[in-house]
Interface confidence: medium
C-alpha cells in the first residue's frame, strides 16, 4: 500500500526544487488528522501539480517569495 492509502496525504513524493518561473501558485497544507506531515503543493503554469519538499532551502525561498508577492498584490 502506498503512503496515500495509509493517510489522506496528497504528496507521495517530493521534488527537491523547481524553477520559480514555472510556478503559478503554492499552497502549504499544515498537518492534521488527514495527514501528519506538512505538504507544499505547487500549481505549475502548465496546470499540473507538484509536491515540493518543505525542508528544502530552495523550496523555503520559493514559499517566502510567493507569500511576499501575495502581500504586495
Amino acid at each position: 500500500a502506498s503512503v496515500a492509502t495509509e493517510l489522506r496525504c496528497q504528496c507521495l513524493q517530493t521534488l527537491q526544487g523547481i524553477h520559480p518561473k514555472n510556478i503559478q501558485s503554492v499552497n502549504v497544507k499544515s498537518p492534521g488528522p488527514h495527514c501528519a506531515q506538512t505538504e507544499v503543493i505547487a500549481t505549475l503554469k502548465n496546470g499540473r501539480k507538484a509536491c515540493l519538499n518543505p525542508a528544502s532551502p530552495i523550496v523555503k525561498k520559493i514559499i517566502e517569495k510567493m507569500l511576499n508577492s501575495d502581500k504586495s498584490n
Epitope: A1, T5, R8, C11, L12, K29
Partner: antibody, heavy 125, light 107 residues
Framework: EVQLLESGGGLVQPGGSLRLSCAAS????????MSWVRQAPGKGLEWVSA????????YYADSVKGRFTISRDNSKNTLYLQMNSLRAEDTAVYYC??????????????????WGQGTPVTVSS | DIQMTQSPSSLSASVGDRVTITCRAS??????LHWYQQKPGKAPKLLIY???NLESGVPSRFSGSGSGTDFTLTINSLQPEDFATYYC?????????FGQGTKLEIK
Amino acid sequence: EVQLLESGGGLVQPGGSLRLSCAASGFTFSELSMSWVRQAPGKGLEWVSAISGSGGSTYYADSVKGRFTISRDNSKNTLYLQMNSLRAEDTAVYYCAREGGRLEPYYYYYAMDVWGQGTPVTVSS
Amino acid sequence: DIQMTQSPSSLSASVGDRVTITCRASQSISDNLHWYQQKPGKAPKLLIYDASNLESGVPSRFSGSGSGTDFTLTINSLQPEDFATYYCQQYYSTPLTFGQGTKLEIK
C-alpha cells in the same frame, strides 16, 4: 467493470445495531481509500466515514463517532460499516464510494469516483 | 470543520441556457473541491475534480473554476438530462464536507 454493491440495510429499532456491507469488484480494492456517505430522506449528502487502503487509518463524522465503526476485509474485497446505538436521525440511504485518486507526478488527490446503488436504513419503533 | 455553502439552493432554467452554481468554503481549501451530480433515486456521479478538471466521460459543457474559498460550476447550453441536484465537496481536511446542494429544475 468497476462496481460497488451495498447490502445489510433495513428496519431497526432505536438503540439497535446493523452492519452494512459493500462488495467491490473490477479494481484493486486494497489500493484505495473507501468512504460511506448517507442521505436522509429529502436531504443532502452527508459524509459518514472513511478508511485507508490497508484499514490502518479511519475517519468519522462527529455525528457518528463512538457509535459507528468502519472496517474492510481486503481478502474479500468488502467494506463494512458497523452501526450501533442507532437513532432516528440515522435514517438514510447509505452509499459506499471508492476514493479513486489520480496520480500526477508527485501529487495525489481523492475523489469519490465510483458509488454503490445505496442501501436504505430506517430507524423507527 | 470546514463548512461548504452553495447558492442558489434551487434554480429554474430552460434547455439551452447557461447556468452557474457557486460554492463557498468557510476557510481556504486551495483547489481541493469536487462537484457531483445526483438524479432522483440514483447515486451521485463525479463531474469535476480538483475544482476544474473534467471527469472522464463527462460532457464538455460542464466546467468548474475557483480556488481558495470561492468556486463555480458552469453548465453551458443545458440539456434535458442536466436537470438534477448538484453538490460540491471539499477534501482539504477531514471531516469531509458537502454543500447543501443546488436543485436545477426545468422552467
